[in-house]
């Protein structure tokens, strides 16, 4: 007896298609072997019309697709357009056609409906509208007009033109008699449910010469589309529910137990607590559409998604809807990076961000997600030397360490940068991350001055106290720019006396700037890194004024308790010139992010997600 | 409120036939996928057979004990779910229960995939 099990019949019409399971056991080889699908010939042999090695028949060409889903243990093979010819016996199965892994299918294909019997079929889905035409002759033309439905052998009315409306149909429904040169009535009906199903009859006048015309209203529930991502990856659902609805609420939500479905997050400015800091809604085009981006994917996340729009913003009978199941695959390409990122104010957090390494050249990003009306992420900072203008001097993107991960580095950190950010490139949209920075109690474990006055033509010396804890780190000084963050030499000076409780191996490294010049006003950082992976940060402002007495400034941390708040200094930075564009649609096309800039400052949510994947500032 | 209600059960002879019948109420929409099991005391349920419904195809599965004999059949607008049983045999026995699975994802053959089930009916095949 076979393993391999899927549907022994399916039945289906012209024009239609069809998603046909197969199941295996998921063994590790049976995960990864090849799949297929192919028809029995007359004489026994199994021709392939398609396989998971990329195999696709010029019969099958631009019309079906086989996906396998290693997770659960199955494969799926969807054909569309089909037709008469498609009838037949086919087998699904593992490894080589020859072999006995495989199950027997049976796919019949009957001619699609037609004008039988006079009868008009409509064939739409549930939530739109569909408009019934009914023809009459002259001699009906001031008679009434009206619409039938069959139920079981008697005709129920549901709507005529005298005013009269069934109430099922009831704010759902229109009587539209075209201009007097046509003979013709439309009957439109919106929202539709399943239960509008049926025959239909339309009439013109009540008498033996009245004008008959016989309707038959398929609805049709939305083909789920089976959607595949990446434990820790991003999903992106693109909702076209069309024009009719543009103006009404949009929603996304998640089927639960039964038939309910919990929103995750609608146009109204509802947001499931589970999404926080991990979804945007973009904003509509004009026709309706509009897309949600989930990050950070988890194993919970799987499930039936529907996307739709009603007034209330949630799902409603009649709402048009389309439907995605998303199945997270836990062997995921994305690696683990931590989730929870924690800082203290004042100090530091160095953020690893996964990328897809086939992609070493796109352009990285990293904005801060807001929640606001339906989430927007304003970029921050980017590895082509661009920086908000209110994070120069304590953020810098940085391609390190490279191979699949770039580092994001943001100090002087405050209670408002609290919140969550998102690690992107321009390439894969699926490695979108999220972190989430907490500002937690504690001190800053690199000690510095505050704000520094140079003389120029003279000699300047910043000291950077390192704890203990720090020993075995390399120490580092550097002059921040839009592009990164320089290395400077710096000089050991041997034991720090800054920490108490702290012994032989706390040090004090010096910044010595010779000859001070204007060119070294801006922004310096010392921090502490192993290999390529930056661990705290600290930054320093050194400006630089003209000489008013001879010698050399040594700064100390005492004079530095008393340098004037860092918002002084504002008037002297250079503003980077505004790159914003209004209403960033940063995803609402994969690639759309490459030049989208946003300037505001908007309110910044601090939520806690509950992860157990926790990073402290100061460590990798 | 849900309900599925089974109805067809009943004594028979040996390779004689038989049709189960299951009328579904109370689901907001109609079901994607609906089945049949059946258990006999002490043991599992076991899968007997599945109807699935998406777009206008329709997908018919069978357990390998009940190919060529059972017939599954059904009306998903309407929610109904019959199984025509021919050639039934002693090992046949056992309650039946239908099943209603409105998302149609999970393995056809687990019970664990369906959410509504009915009381079940008894069919006794007597040698």
């Known amino acids: 007896k076979s393993p391999i099990f899927g549907p022994e019949e399916v039945n289906s019409v012209e024009g239609n298609s069809v998603s046909i399971t197969c199941y295996y056991p998921p063994t590790s080889v049976n995960r990864h072997t090849r799949k297929y699908w192919c028809r029995q010939g007359a004489r026994g042999g199994c021709i392939t019309l398609i396989s998971s090695e990329g195999y696709v028949s010029s019969k099958y060409a631009g019309r079906a697709n086989l996906t396998n889903f290693p997770e659960n243990g199955t494969f799926v093979v969807n054909i569309a357009q089909l037709s008469q010819d498609d009838s037949g016996r086919y087998k699904c199965g593992l490894g080589i056609n020859s072999r006995g892994l495989s199950f027997d299918v049976s796919l019949e294909v009957s001619q699609g409906p037609g004008l039988l019997n006079d009868t008009k079929v409509y064939t739409v889905d549930l939530g739109r509208t569909v408009t019934i035409n009914c023809p009459f002759k002259t001699e009906n033309a001031q008679k009434r007009k009206s619409l039938y439905k069959q139920i079981g052998l008697y005709p129920v009315l549901v709507i005529d033109s005298s005013g009269y409306v069934n109430p099922n149909y009831t704010g759902r429904i229109r009587l539209d008699i075209q201009g007097t040169g046509q003979l013709l009535f439309s009957v439109v009906i919106n929202q539709l449910r399943l239960s509008d199903a049926g025959q239909y009859l339309c009439q013109a006048g009540d008498d033996s010469n009245s004008n008959k015309k016989n309707a038959d209203l398929q609805v049709l529930k939305p083909e789920p589309e089976l959607v595949y991502e990446d434990l820790r990856g991003s999903v992106t659902f693109h909702c076209a529910l069309g024009p009719e609805v543009a103006n009404v609420a949009k929603f996304l939500c998640r089927q639960s137990s039964g038939e309910n479905c919990d929103v995750v997050v609608n146009t109204l400015g509802k947001r499931a607590p589970a999404f926080e800091g991990r979804i945007l809604l973009n904003p509509q085009d004009k026709d309706g559409s509009f897309s949600v981006v989930i990050t950070g994917l988890r194993k919970e996340d799987a499930g039936r998604y529907l996307c739709g729009a009603h007034s209330d913003g949630q799902l409603q009978e009649g709402s048009p809807i389309q439907a995605w199941q998303l199945f997270v695959n836990e062997e995921s390409t994305i690696p683990r990076s931590p989730t929870v990122v924690k800082g203290v104010a004042g100090g530091s957090v160095a953020v690893l961000c996964p990328y897809n390494r086939k992609e070493s050249k796109s352009i990285k990003y990293w904005c801060l997600w807001e929640g606001a009306q339906n989430g927007r992420c304003p970029l921050l900072v980017d590895s082509e030397g661009w920086v908000k203008a209110q994070y120069e001097g304590r953020l810098s993107l940085l391609e390190e360490p490279g191979n699949g991960t770039f580092t994001v580095i943001l100090n002087q950190l405050t209670s408002r940068d609290a919140g969550f950010y998102w690690c992107l490139t321009n390439g894969d949209t699926l490695w979108r991350t999220t972190v989430e920075i907490k500002i937690i109690e504690g001190e800053p474990n690199l000690k510095v001055p505050g704000n520094v006055t140079a003389v120029l033509g003279e000699t300047l010396k910043v000291p950077c106290h390192f704890p203990c804890k720090f020993s075995s780190y390399e120490k580092y000084w550097c002059k921040w720019n839009n592009t990164g963050c320089q290395a400077l030499p710096s000089q050991d000076e041997g034991p720090s006396k800054a920490f108490v409780n702290c012994d032989e191996n706390s040090r004090l490294v010096s910044l010595t700037l010779n000859l001070v010049t204007r060119a070294d006003e801006g922004w310096y950082w010392c921090g502490v890194k192993q290999g390529h992976f930056y661990g705290e940060t600290a930054a320093v402002y050194v400006a630089v004024e003209e000489r008013k007495a001879a010698g050399s400034r040594d700064v100390s941390l005492a004079k530095a308790d008393a340098a004037p708040d860092e918002k002084v200094l504002d008037s002297g930075f250079r503003e980077i010139e505004n790159k914003a564009i209004q209403d960033p649609r940063l995803f609402a096309e994969e690639k759309a992010v490459a030049d989208t800039r946003d300037q505001a400052d908007g309110s910044r949510a601090s939520v806690d997600s509950g992860s157990s994947e926790e990073q402290g500032g100061s460590s990798r | 409120e849900v309900q599925l209600v089974e109805s067809g059960g009943g004594v028979v002879q040996a390779e004689d036939s038989l049709r189960l019948s299951c009328a579904a109420s109370?689901?907001?929409?109609?079901?994607?996928?609906m089945g049949w099991f059946r258990q006999v005391p002490g043991k599992e349920r076991e899968f007997v057979a599945a109807?699935?419904?998406?777009?206008?195809?329709?997908?018919?599965y069978y357990d390998d004990s009940v190919k060529g004999r059972f017939t599954v059949s059904g009306d998903n607008a309407k929610n109904t779910l019959d199984l025509q049983m021919k050639g039934l045999k002693p090992e046949d026995t056992a309650v039946y229960y239908c099943?209603?699975?409105?998302?149609?994802?999970?393995?056809?053959?687990?019970?664990?995939?369906?959410?509504?089930w009915g009381q079940g009916t008894q069919v006794t095949v007597s040698s």
């Open positions: 099943a209603a699975d409105p998302n149609y994802y999970g393995d056809v053959r687990t019970s664990g995939t369906y959410q509504y």
């Open positions: 109370g689901l907001p929409f109609s079901s994607s996928r």
């Open positions: 109807i699935g419904w998406s777009g206008r195809s329709t997908y018919r």
